[in-house]
């Protein structure tokens, strides 16, 4: 369908704009310009803009969305949007969400099956263990930062945080009441779905029924399926299935290739959707701002809480995570972050880690040189279990509520908050109604009132976006760290531990290790056995 890219005199494919607006192929220096933005001459500036077109469009879309939202909500009068008009206004954004959600299921399943099948079990185990360790440590650090910031800034003790108009009955009705044990049992049940088809759109959740048993009313747990993809179950199944396919040896080869091809086709769709992302993001952000009734009052009342959350997310995302990345890789973390601006902005716009997953995969592979078998194995797991942003927000919220209700927090309680926030953020993907329910679990664990959860919900639309950005950033940096780990271990050992994803070109040739520094260049042996022919992954856009 797509013609071979033109070749220059050295036999390398000429620079072509890729689906995400970056350069599919360029010299190392040009890649530097694309990622880091060193644009000198007019020609370089033009190339730089072209390389970063989608990134710039996405950033502009967020800013334009805020401006549009404020403009529409400020205009009022004839422009005032009722619920029916609002849904039409947000429609382009809704379309983006639907497109991304459409892609999630085949992407997660196929990429994980392909990823797990392309790694030998030992390497898979090591990679998974390092990934989980990274996710756990960073989540714990985020939790500690959240608690520390909230104790220092005291958002709940600020007079503006609450006022007399906040009803005494707060939100007892809004606060989900669920036993901590049942929440974690639901998590375990969702890891092992009883029906794979229904796991694609339903999760298991425990509710309660009051029954009269010998004259006493007893709360009996009742299991039921609730709306919402059981992503955790699908992730676990896909990994195990991938390992099983690898165990089959030659018999499983065909199916592995099928899943890899399916994955490649899905990524082609992603590359098309990416160009629509800025439009969708703009309307999602604008729609949310229009929807908010009194943003000013909300900020006046909860300003310090919002500041605490956003500041925590900024410190963790711009200092802590990059520092960890730098310490382990000795590479510029901000260049890495520049390469994933589009998915980060998409995360802000969609407020969904899984919806951002397709774009993140594409960007870390094409802009940041993360190998496919790593990104497609690590990122879906990260999107499911790595929630630094959520853990940080929950810790801030717990301390905020403690301060708001003048409840003391001793050392034991603070440790309990840290541990519970870390554990429940890891399990949040397996718990339907994630954020608020996991916050309720933390509050229950330290005997804090759940009444003020309604205050947290009031600004969740903003804080949750910030959470999502941090969550997906953590996933991407984790993938980058693991790529570095793999590079180091492979350069030390003579035999590579990891085999390439098998469907990158026609079925016959096996690739030799990729050229250092440019993961987008793959050298394959030509018909005559020479290794001079360079092939580029087809750029569809």
């Amino acid at each position: 369908m797509v013609a071979d890219p033109p070749r220059d005199s050295k036999g390398l494919a000429a620079a072509e704009p890729t689906a995400n607006g970056g350069l599919a192929l360029a010299s190392i220096e040009d890649q530097g310009a694309a990622a880091g933005g060193y644009c000198g001459s007019r020609d370089q500036v033009r190339r730089c803009l072209r390389a970063n077109l989608l990134v710039l469009l996405t950033v502009v879309a967020v800013v334009a969305g805020v401006a549009l939202g404020l403009g529409v909500s400020g205009a009022g009068g004839a422009l005032a949007l009722g619920p029916e008009r609002l849904s039409a206004f947000v429609f382009p954004g809704e379309l983006l969400l639907r497109l991304l959600r459409m892609i999630i299921l085949p992407l997660v399943v196929c990429s994980l099956i392909g990823g797990a099948a392309s790694l030998d079990p030992g390497a898979l185990g090591r990679l998974g263990a390092w990934a989980l360790l990274f996710f756990l440590v960073t989540t714990l650090l985020a939790s500690a930062l959240g608690v520390g910031l909230a104790l220092a800034l005291q958002p709940g003790a600020a007079s503006a945080a609450i006022n007399a108009s906040v009803g005494a009955a707060g939100s007892a009705e809004n606060a989900p009441s669920k036993e901590v044990l049942d929440s974690f049992l639901d998590l375990a049940r969702n890891i092992f779905p009883s029906n794979l088809v229904s796991a694609a759109f339903r999760s298991y959740s425990t509710t309660y029924e009051e029954r009269n048993i010998t004259g006493t009313r007893v709360k009996v747990p009742v299991g039921q399926e609730v709306e919402g993809m059981n992503i955790l179950g699908l992730v676990v199944f896909a990994i195990v299935f991938g390992v099983a396919l690898r165990k089959l040896g030659p018999e499983g080869e065909l199916l592995i290739r099928f899943f890899n091809s399916f994955n490649e086709a899905t990524m082609v769709l992603v590359s098309w959707i990416m160009w629509y992302a800025p439009v969708g993001i703009m309307f999602l952000v604008a729609g949310k701002i229009v929807e908010m009734e009194d943003v000013g009052l909300l900020f006046a009342r909860l300003g310090k809480y919002i500041l605490c959350c956003l500041l925590g997310h900024a410190i963790h995302g711009l200092l802590v995570l990059p520092l960890i990345y730098f310490l382990f890789t000795r590479k510029n973390p901000y260049r890495f972050l520049w390469g994933i601006v589009t998915p980060l902005a998409t995360a802000f716009g969609t407020s969904s880690s899984s919806a951002t997953l397709p774009l993140m995969m594409k960007c870390v592979e094409e802009n940041n040189g993360v190998a496919k078998h790593i990104s497609r194995f690590i990122l879906p797991i990260g999107a499911t279990v790595n929630m630094d942003g959520a853990a940080l927000f929950q810790c801030v919220a717990a301390v905020f509520i403690a301060q708001l209700s003048q409840q003391s927090l001793d050392f034991v309680k603070i440790i309990t908050i840290l541990v519970t926030a870390t554990a429940s953020s890891v399990g949040a993907a397996g718990i339907p109604a994630g954020g608020v329910l996991t916050l309720a679990i933390i509050l229950e664990a330290v005997n804090l009132p759940v009444d003020h959860i309604s205050l947290i919900l009031a600004v969740d639309w903003l804080v949750d976006r910030s959470c999502t950005v941090l969550n997906v950033e953590g996933d991407a940096l984790g993938a980058g760290l693991l790529q570095n780990y793999v590079d180091r271990t492979e350069s030390r050992s003579t035999e590579p531990e990891l085999i390439q994803v098998k469907s990158e070109l026609p079925l016959d040739p096996l690739p030799v290790p990729t050229e250092e520094g440019n993961p987008l260049l793959k050298h394959y042996r030509g018909p005559a056995g020479d290794a001079t022919v360079a092939s580029e992954k087809e750029s569809v856009m």
Partner: antibody, heavy 120, light 107 residues
Framework: QIQLVQSGPELKKPGAPVKISCKAS????????MSWVKQAPGQGLKWMGW????????IYGDDFKGRFVFSLDTSVSTAYLQISSVKAEDTATYFC?????????????WGQGTTLTVSS | DIQMTQSPSSLSASLGDRVTITCRAS??????LNWYQQKPGKAPKLLIY???RLHSGVPSRFSGSGSGTDYTLTISSLQPEDFATYFC?????????FGQGTKLEIK
């Protein structure tokens, strides 16, 4: 030891204002919330609301919004309950009660109570 | 608001008796149940918080139990100073609500 000492009984005409005080001692005043509880003659206890003693922010129960005002003077560790315009149904004993800083909402120390009688 | 229902509303007992007062909440209050004792013309005194924890200075003959919506206060051996009115109170959600009281009298 921890003590909450309330002002003496009050006899008021309908429409008059009243201010009841509650002086705390034996603990750090701004660490614990202060609640107010009403007990009408021969009746049970009714929670009126509480005041955040650190932030000075009051929270009122649904039946006590409007004429009732909770305030503080942290320099003398004292909480106040003010009723702007008393009515006959305000006749009751009013207790200040220290809100515990643990296990959500309970009251570990109480003032002796201030009896308010509203009569024309 | 959560309704609290105490039973019985009054009871007569003799010194040394074992007495049980029950309290039922209109919804699950997750053990945030507290008990107070009030004598005529006096302020209430906290006896038990969080279902079963004895407040400092409260004699060990007082004990509490229960879960979900049903809770009990037990006095293992009645003493002369125990004759008073007892209130239960839920501290699960705002507003905190009290039971109507149980008056314990000498038989």
């Amino acid at each position: 030891q921890i003590q909450l000492v309330q002002s003496g009984p009050e006899l008021k005409k309908p429409g008059a204002p009243v201010k009841i005080s509650c002086k705390a001692s034996g603990y750090t005043f701004t660490t614990f919330g202060m609640s107010w509880v009403k007990q009408a003659p021969g009746q049970g206890l009714k929670w009126m609301g509480w005041i955040h003693t650190y932030a000075g922010v009051p929270i009122y129960g649904d039946d006590f919004k409007g004429r009732f005002v909770f305030s503080l003077d942290t320099s003398v560790s004292t909480a106040y309950l003010q009723i702007s315009s008393v009515k006959a149904e305000d006749t009751a004993t009013y207790f200040c009660a220290r809100r515990s800083d643990n296990y959500r909402y309970f009251f570990d120390y109480w003032g002796q109570g201030t009896t308010l009688t509203v009569s024309s | 608001d959560i309704q609290m229902t105490q039973s019985p509303s009054s009871l007569s007992a003799s010194l040394g008796d074992r007495v049980t007062i029950t309290c039922r909440a209109s919804q699950d209050i997750r053990n945030y149940l507290n008990w107070y004792q009030q004598k005529p013309g006096k302020a209430p005194k906290l006896l038990i918080y969080y279902t079963s924890r004895l407040h400092s200075g409260v004699p060990s003959r007082f004990s509490g139990s229960g879960s979900g919506t049903d809770y009990t206060l037990t006095i293992s051996s009645l003493q002369p100073e125990d004759f008073a009115t007892y209130f239960c109170q839920q501290g699960h959600t705002l507003p905190p609500t009290f039971g109507q009281g149980t008056k314990l009298e000498i038989k």
